[in-house]
Structures are given as C-alpha cells and as structure tokens.
C-alpha cells in the first residue's frame, strides 16, 4: 500500500433528503464488486487520504427512464462531481447533462489532496438507478 | 511483465450468429492499434490471466445510425459488459442503453481473477460499427 | 519522472480559425486544475515525449446547447481525436458524434510514440464550452 495505489469503486446507496442533491455512496466486498483501498467514506461521501493525481470516473443511469423522460417531461437533469470540502478547495471537477439520454459516463484526471471530499450532485426530478452495473463512481491514484 | 502490467485494447471482429448477442473481438499490431499484453482471446472473448483490479473501458458506435434510428424506429439497443465464465462468477459489470444516441462509452474499476472471461452483449436490431476509432474494448490492470 | 509517468490534463483555450477544425488546448496550475507533466503543448496541440501505451480521454460539451440544437437545427457535430503529425503516423484514434446530446466523453488505450502530436477536431456549427468541468482532454502513460 506504500506505493500509493489508492483506489476506490463505489455503488449508490441512496439519494439525499429533499434539499440535498448529493448522491450517497457505499463500498465493500460484502456489497458486491465495490471496494475502498485507501480512500474512505464519510457519511456516504468519498474522502481522499493521499495527495496525488487521480483518475476520477463516474457513470449514472436514471431509473425508469426513456429518452422522452429526460427531454420533454422533466426538469433538466445534471450530474456534477466536485470537491465539496474543505470549503477553501471547493470546485466542480466534472459536469454532464442528460439531455435526451438516460446515462452519463465520463472520466478525468485531476489533482486531489489528502482530506478532499468529493461530492456527486444530481439535480433534476429523476432518480438514479441503484443497479451496480448502471451507476458507479470511482477514483484511482495514478501518480504523485 | 512481472510487474503485472496486463493490458489489452481490442477492435471489433464480428457479431455473433442469430441467437448470440456477444460481440467478437480481435487484437494485434497487424490489425492496427489493437494489442494484447497479458490477457488473451478465446474465440473472440477476452480472458484475464492475472488477478487484480482492472480498469475496463468500452466504446460502441452503431452502424449507419441517426438519433431517430435509436429512439423510435428500432428495438431498444443495450450494451452490457460482464463476466460470462466461469459460470460461478457470472455477473454484469457495466450496462448502457443507447436511447437517442448512436454511441455509448464508459469505464469502470472492477476486481477480476485469472480465468475470468469477459463478454460484451449487444442487444437490439442495429449493427455495431467496425471502424476502429468508433468501437473498441479494453482492460488495464491497475493494482493487485 | 524516470518512471515514465507522463501525464497531462488540458483545458480548452480556443477554437481554430475558419478552416481549422482543431481545438486549441492549454494547461498549467495557474489556469486551474490542468497540468502537463512530460507531454508538451505545441501551438495548442499536445505532443508526446515518451513512447508507450497511453490512456487518452476527452470530454467536450457544446456551448448553449439543447438536444434540439444538435439534432435538427445544426450540421452533424463530430469530435475526432487523432495523431496529426508526423504525417506518416496520421490516424484517427477516437471518434464520436453528438447526435441528440450536448456532451461526448470517451477514453481509449493506444500506443503513442515520442513526437506524436494529437489533434482534436470538432466539426459542425456549434462552439465547445470553455468551462473547465465540461471540456477537457488528457493523456496518461500506462506502460512501455
């Protein structure tokens, strides 16, 4: 572990209460194929424990969704991944809108520091799928 | 190679016969920019030869496709990547529907074991593009 | 650095003049969360300085875009990532069309050689967003 191979792959646990757009994540072999090796969860949010450049990736699929759901009927649905704490480092890292699709997936390289907590904010009126092959979120340390 | 840097990037060879939703892959420098360094192909399916956590990624583009093709005219098209053998480890790792798009692309971290064979199942009534910059599938060992 | 951990994450600087479909990139801590560690920029295009297999990833979001923008009103919008020089190695590595969406995101593994310059060509009549969480392009050396 001293090599700094910090890595995590999380599955969706639940959405937040009414005014909280955050997705709450969980991980661990008992839950399926999710895991945390280095990073940790703090009330469902992912906290980084080692400085470095990370590959952050996410896929979110909307539940009971058709292309008409995301286009006409509903409020625009957007997913943003960002550092939400500490407040001094708050920033949006990755943002996608669903438009006429029901799934977004992306990835990016970004510097993260020990103590950074990543939040994934889903705005809109559709629920994310909890299927582990449809919605997941992960980070991988790639270099100092 | 003892570092465990197993890696592969594959291009589409062909689709399966009528009742077989699997995509059949090929790789090697003679074919273009695809390669296998560690993992191997078994009848067009990717077999893992080293335990570890892997980054699995895929992009599939549908042939002669327009947004109307995938939404209204045609049967819903879905791509699923999973472990298909050994049967005891069979599971879906990654699933995406095309909805009103003609391309899906995603990636995820997942633990894989020596002998796991990955299958990519494309259901629907549209063909995948065989262009090597539009359809590809790869894995990268990232840590034990 | 001798480990060969070449890595870069770039943000959009500007689009090219009328007949030039290339996107021009910039990177560096002073600009935000973009960086170049090994690869370098040559007139806004990314040049590789170390042979190896790289993970190339990109996300491009179209500015002031709705799903109707990309489908009905406008010329088909496509993003292609390729080696544009040296001419002898010119090839398209990754290609995506926007169809009814406003964002494309993908990634792939590909062998790159010292001196390869990567170009990202955006064809169509819509501008890419310059927001750093919506449009970015990066490479990561993963093995020799």
């Amino acid at each position: 572990e001293s090599l700094g191979w910090d890595i995590a792959e999380l599955q969706l646990n639940h959405t937040g209460p009414q005014q909280d757009p955050r997705l709450y994540w969980q991980g661990g072999p008992a839950l399926g194929r999710s895991f945390l090796r280095g990073p940790e969860l703090d009330k469902g949010q992912l906290r980084i424990r080692r400085d470095g450049i990370y590959m952050v990736h996410i896929q979110v699929t909307l539940a009971i969704c058709s292309s008409t759901s995301t286009s006409r009927h509903h409020h625009p649905t957007t997913l943003a991944v960002g550092i939400c704490s500490p407040a001094s480092r708050s920033i949006s890292l990755l943002r996608l809108s669903f438009h006429q699709g029901c799934t977004i997936a992306s990835q990016r390289l970004t510097p993260l520091a020990r103590g950074d907590t990543l939040c994934t904010n889903l705005t809109g009126t559709l629920l994310p799928s909890r299927n582990t092959d449809e919605t997941f979120f992960g980070v991988q340390w790639v270099r100092p | 190679e003892s570092l465990g840097w197993d890696i592969a990037e594959l291009q589409l060879n062909h689709t399966g016969p009528q009742q077989d939703p699997r995509l059949y892959w090929q790789g090697g420098p003679a074919l273009g920019r695809s390669f296998l360094r560690g993992p191997e192909l078994d009848k067009g399916q990717l077999r893992i030869r080293r335990d570890g956590i892997y980054m699995v990624h895929i992009q599939v583009t549908l042939a002669i496709c327009s947004s109307t093709s995938t939404s209204r005219h045609h049967h819903p098209t879905t791509l699923a990547v999973g472990i298909c053998s050994p049967a005891s480890r069979s599971i879906s790792l990654l699933r995406l529907s095309f909805h009103q798009g003609c391309t899906i692309a995603s990636q995820r971290l997942t633990p894989l074991a020596r002998g796991d064979t990955l299958c990519t199942n494309l259901t629907g009534t549209l063909l995948p593009s065989r262009n090597t910059d539009e359809t590809f599938f790869g894995v990268q060992w990232v840590r034990p | 650095e001798s480990l060969g951990w070449d890595i870069a994450e770039l943000q959009l600087n500007h689009t090219g003049p009328q007949q030039d479909p290339r996107l021009y990139w910039q990177g560096g801590p002073a600009l935000g969360r973009s960086f170049l560690r090994g690869p370098e920029l040559d007139k806004g295009q990314l040049r590789i300085r170390r042979d190896g297999i790289y993970m190339v990833h990109i996300q491009v979001t179209l500015a002031i875009c709705s799903s109707t923008s990309t489908s009905r009103h406008h010329h088909p919008t496509t993003l292609a990532v390729g080696i544009c020089s040296p001419a002898s190695r010119s090839i398209s590595l990754l290609r995506l069309s926007f169809h009814q969406g406003c964002t494309i995101a993908s990634q792939r593994l590909t062998p790159l050689a010292r001196g390869d310059t990567l170009c990202t060509n955006l064809t169509g009549t819509l501008l890419p967003s310059r927001n750093t969480d919506e449009t970015f392009f990066g490479v990561q050396w993963v093995r020799p």
């Epitope: - | 049967h75 063909l127 262009n131 090597t132 539009e134 | -």
Partner: antibody
Framework: QVQLKQSGPGLVQPSQSLSITCTVS????????VHWVRQSPGKGLEWLGV???????DYNAALMSRLNITKDNSKSQVFFKMNSLQTDDTAIYYC?????????????WGQGTLVSVSA | DIVLTQSPASLAVSLGQRATISCRAS??????????LHWYQQKPGQPPKLLIY???NLESGVPARFSGSGSGTDFTLNIHPVEEEDAATYYC?????????FGAGTKLELK
Amino acid sequence: QVQLKQSGPGLVQPSQSLSITCTVSDFSLTIFGVHWVRQSPGKGLEWLGVIWRDGSTDYNAALMSRLNITKDNSKSQVFFKMNSLQTDDTAIYYCAKNRRYDYAWFPYWGQGTLVSVSA
Amino acid sequence: DIVLTQSPASLAVSLGQRATISCRASKSVSASGYSFLHWYQQKPGQPPKLLIYLTSNLESGVPARFSGSGSGTDFTLNIHPVEEEDAATYYCQHSRDFPPTFGAGTKLELK
C-alpha cells in the same frame, strides 16, 4: 419458423387503389420492421417502403404521395395501400424482412402478390 | 439514389466452371466498417433468395460455392464450381441509405 403470408386482389382498375395484407408469424412487429418491394418487367426490383416497430414509416420518395403502410401488432398484420394505380404499376408485390437487424437486406420474403392494372 | 450496374446482363457457364458477376455502385455503399451490398438468386415464380449479405457473409443454408467480395463501389459474386441448380437470375442490392436499390440482374445459363 418465420413466415410472411400475403393476401390481396390480383386485378386492379386504373386510378383505383391497391390493398395487400402481410400476415407474419414467429416474430413480433413490435421488434422488427417490415419492408415492401415490387418487381416488374419494366423497372425490375424496386423498394417501396418500410414500417418500423413504432409504426413510423419511410417511403420511396418517387412514390411517397401514393403509399400508406400501417399495421396491427396484435394481429401480426401489415397493411400496404397504394393509390391511383396506372398500368406501369403492374408488378409482383412482396413484403420482406431482415432476420436480426433493421437494415434493408431480406432473408425472408412473402410469396408475392401478382397485381395487374388493367381496365 | 444509388444506382447499381450489373454486368454482364447474361452469361453462360459450363458445369464445374466459375461464374463471375460484377456490380458497380454509383457511389460508395461502405460505412461503419461494412459494405452494405447484398446478393440474391431468383428463379421463375419464386421471390428472391438472399445468398450473401454485407458483401461476403454467406446466408444460412447457402452452399459454400457462392462467395462475395469487394468494397466501396465495386463488388463481385463468384460461383465455383457452377452446378445445374445455379441457373437463375442474380441481383445485387445495397442498403447503405434510403432508398435501397437493386441491380437490373444477371441471368446465368448453363452451357
């Protein structure tokens, strides 16, 4: 196995309309599209149109104003209607479909309906 | 519309010999790594029978003496060795875009 069976009149008066029914078995019209093709000595094989799984249609532009293709999924029937027939519409009319995909190549054909346009 | 030109219009081949039929498209019928060109055989009183799809894929149940090749705009159907039951008219067809179109046909007779 997959079958397409056609029924319809053999003789049509000029300026009248033609109606043919294609009844399909062993596949669902909610999954696959059904195409129509005709064959005449003068024009050879000519693609006429298609009805997709959702009921939307594409027609040969040269004939679009005269064609109407509809279906009844529950009865597994596709209905082909062509208006204002003239003598050069005399042909064998076929319904056809692909085996697995929605591209226009055709392993499966109806038996054909010979249509003569004559006073 | 894409025009498909078949040649020859007819040919006579001896049993066991090779028959070669050409089909030329007015513009490319290739896309997405495929050539959307197909071949049919038709005998009198029957609908066309699909032999080959996507240039070179043999339809189920079609004998291996039938083969197809080509790309872009130029395509070939080969029959070797020709057998008695192969006497028929052969058509090429594209499905690159709408409308799909057919060639005018090549009539194969046995010497």
